[in-house]
C-alpha cells in the first residue's frame, strides 16, 4: 500500500527532515508550511494548526519561501547617478545600477551602493581600457605617431594622418596638418569610440620621442581599474 501523505502540521519521523517548502517549528515540534515569496508568517503553527501567512506590505518583500514574522524593507530609492533596473515588489527588492557614464565603485549584494563618474582621458592620452559596470576607464599616453585631442572617457589614441606634404607635424594631442594636397589616412575615417560605461585613468610623462625607426605597431587591450592620476580628469 502507498504511504499516506502527511498534511502540515505533522510530527516528522525520528531522524528525518521536513519536506520541501516546510520548516521544523521548534516550539510546536512539528513540520509546518513555509510562506511563499511575497508573504510572511502572520501566525506561527501549533501542534494543531498550520502557519498563517499574509502578504507583504507596501515597500517590503520576501524573495524566498520563508517563515519570517515580518517582510524585509526594500532599499531606499535610487540616487540621481543610478537607474532602477528592478522595481520594489512584494517578491523582490529594488535594484539600482549606475547610469551610463558612471561605474559601480562600491557594490552590494545586488546592485550598487556607490556610483562614480567614469574617468575622462585628457588630450594627449587615450582610453587604454574601457570601463565596465564595475571598473573605471584606464588612460595611457598616446604613443609616438598617435594622438587624442579630446577630453573623453571613450576616445582612444589614433594614428596621425599621413601627409604628402606636412604643414604642421602632429603630436600627442594634435593630428598632423597637411598642406592643401589631400592627405591619406592611416585609418578609416571617423573617431573610434569605446562603449559606455567607461571612464579614464592615469597618464603621465610625455611619450618618449619618436624612435629613429618607426615602431612596428600592434595592440592589445587595456586593463583593470585604477585611481585617477595626472592624465585623467573628473567629470
Amino acid at each position: 500500500l502507498p504511504a499516506q501523505v502527511a498534511f502540515t502540521p505533522y510530527a516528522p519521523e525520528p531522524g528525518s527532515t521536513c519536506r520541501l517548502r516546510e520548516y521544523y517549528d521548534q516550539t510546536a515540534q512539528m513540520c509546518c508550511s513555509k510562506c511563499s515569496p511575497g508573504q510572511h508568517a502572520k501566525v506561527f503553527c501549533t501542534k494543531t494548526s498550520d502557519t498563517v501567512c499574509d502578504s507583504c506590505e507596501d515597500s517590503t518583500y520576501t524573495q524566498l519561501w520563508n517563515w519570517v514574522p515580518e517582510c524585509l524593507s526594500c532599499g531606499s530609492r535610487c540616487s540621481s547617478d543610478q537607474v532602477e533596473t528592478q522595481a520594489c515588489t512584494r517578491e523582490q527588492n529594488r535594484i539600482c545600477t549606475c547610469r551610463p557614464g558612471w561605474y559601480c565603485a562600491l557594490s552590494k549584494q545586488e546592485g550598487c551602493r556607490l556610483c562614480a563618474p567614469l574617468r575622462k582621458c585628457r588630450p594627449g592620452f587615450g582610453v587604454a581600457r574601457p570601463g565596465t559596470e564595475t571598473s573605471d576607464v584606464v588612460c595611457k599616453p598616446c604613443a609616438p605617431g598617435t594622438f587624442s585631442n579630446t577630453t573623453s572617457s571613450t576616445d582612444i589614441c589614433r594614428p596621425h594622418q599621413i601627409c604628402n606634404v606636412v604643414a604642421i607635424p602632429g603630436n600627442a594631442s594634435m593630428d598632423a596638418v597637411c598642406t592643401s594636397t589631400s592627405p591619406t589616412r592611416s585609418m578609416a575615417p571617423g573617431a573610434v569610440h569605446l562603449p559606455q560605461p567607461v571612464s579614464t585613468r592615469s597618464q603621465h610623462t610625455q611619450p618618449t620621442p619618436e624612435p629613429s625607426t618607426a615602431p612596428s605597431t600592434s595592440f592589445l587591450l587595456p586593463m583593470g581599474p585604477s585611481p585617477p592620476a595626472e592624465g585623467s580628469t573628473g567629470d
Epitope: C142, A188, T217, A229
Partner: antibody
Framework: QVQLVQSGAEVKKPGASVKVSCKAS????????IHWVRQAPGQGLEWIGR????????EYAPNFQDRATMTTDTSTSTAYLELSSLRSEDTAVYYC???????????WGQGTTVTVSS | QAVVTQEPSLTVSPGGTVTLTCRSS?????????ANWVQQKPGQAFRGLIG???DRAPGVPARFSGSLLGGKAALTLSGAQPEDEAEYYC?????????FGGGTKLTVL
C-alpha cells in the same frame, strides 16, 4: 631606442615553476602595459595576460588565472611572468610585449624558450 | 573562454586581393571587440597591422585594411606583394582579456 630584453631559456620538470624576466629600456615603463604571450612549437599565439607597471593591476586569460603571476619592478624597469604547476603543454616561447590594442606602441622581446620535460 | 577562428591558410597571386577573416564563438564580432591584426614573418619580430577594427598602425602600407564583414573581423590585402607572405593573427577583446585566433598562413604565389 625601445628594447625589451628577456631572460634566457629554461628547462623545467613537470610540476615546477618558472619565472621569466623582461627588462624594458628606451621609454618610461609605466606609460604602457606589458603583455605576456606564448607560442608553442608549430602553434599560434596565446595571450596570457597583461600588467600595468604603473599600479601593478593585472588581467589574465581565463586559462591562466590560477597559474600565472605577472609583476613589475619599476625601479629596474623589469616585468616578470611566473608560471606554476608546469606541464609538458607549457613548452613554448614566451614573449613580453608592449603590444596593446589602443596604443600602437608595439615592441616585443626576443622570446624565452621554456621546455617542460621529465 | 571564447574561441577565435581564422582560415588556416590562404593563397593570393602577386598584385591580387585577399580577405582574411576572424570569427568569434560568442556571436558577431563588433567594434567592442577592438579587432587587432598582427603579422609574423619567419625569423622576424611580430608587427601589429590593424587596431580598433580598422585603424592602420603607423607605418603600415595602405594596401592593408581592416573592417567588419558579416559579423566577422576582416583584414583585406589589396595588391599583395611577395613580402606580405606571413602568418596573420587576429586578436579580439572580451571585456577583460584578449583571445588570439589560430592564425592564417598567407602564401603569395
Amino acid at each position: 631606442q625601445v628594447q625589451l630584453v628577456q631572460s634566457g631559456a629554461e628547462v623545467k620538470k613537470p610540476g615546477a615553476s618558472v619565472k621569466v624576466s623582461c627588462k624594458a629600456s628606451g621609454y618610461t615603463i609605466t606609460d604602457f602595459y606589458i603583455h605576456w604571450v606564448r607560442q608553442a612549437p608549430g602553434q599560434g599565439l596565446e595571450w596570457i595576460g597583461r600588467v600595468d607597471p604603473e599600479d601593478g593591476n593585472t588581467e589574465y586569460a581565463p586559462n591562466f588565472q590560477d597559474r600565472a603571476t605577472m609583476t613589475t619592478d619599476t625601479s629596474t624597469s623589469t616585468a616578470y611572468l611566473e608560471l606554476s604547476s608546469l606541464r609538458s603543454e607549457d613548452t613554448a616561447v614566451y614573449y613580453c610585449s608592449t603590444w596593446d590594442g589602443f596604443s600602437y606602441f608595439d615592441y616585443w622581446g626576443q622570446g624565452t624558450t621554456v621546455t617542460v620535460s621529465s | 573562454q571564447a574561441v577565435v577562428t581564422q582560415e588556416p591558410s590562404l593563397t593570393v597571386s602577386p598584385g591580387g586581393t585577399v580577405t582574411l577573416t576572424c570569427r568569434s564563438s560568442t556571436g558577431p564580432v563588433t567594434t567592442n571587440n577592438y579587432a587587432n591584426w598582427v603579422q609574423q614573418k619567419p625569423g622576424q619580430a611580430f608587427r601589429g597591422l590593424i587596431g580598433g577594427t580598422n585603424d592602420r598602425a603607423p607605418g603600415v602600407p595602405a594596401r592593408f585594411s581592416g573592417s567588419l564583414l558579416g559579423g566577422k573581423a576582416a583584414l583585406t590585402l589589396s595588391g599583395a606583394q611577395p613580402e606580405d607572405e606571413a602568418e596573420y593573427y587576429c586578436a579580439l577583446w572580451y571585456r577583460n582579456h584578449w583571445v588570439f585566433g589560430g592564425g592564417t598562413k598567407l602564401t603569395v604565389l
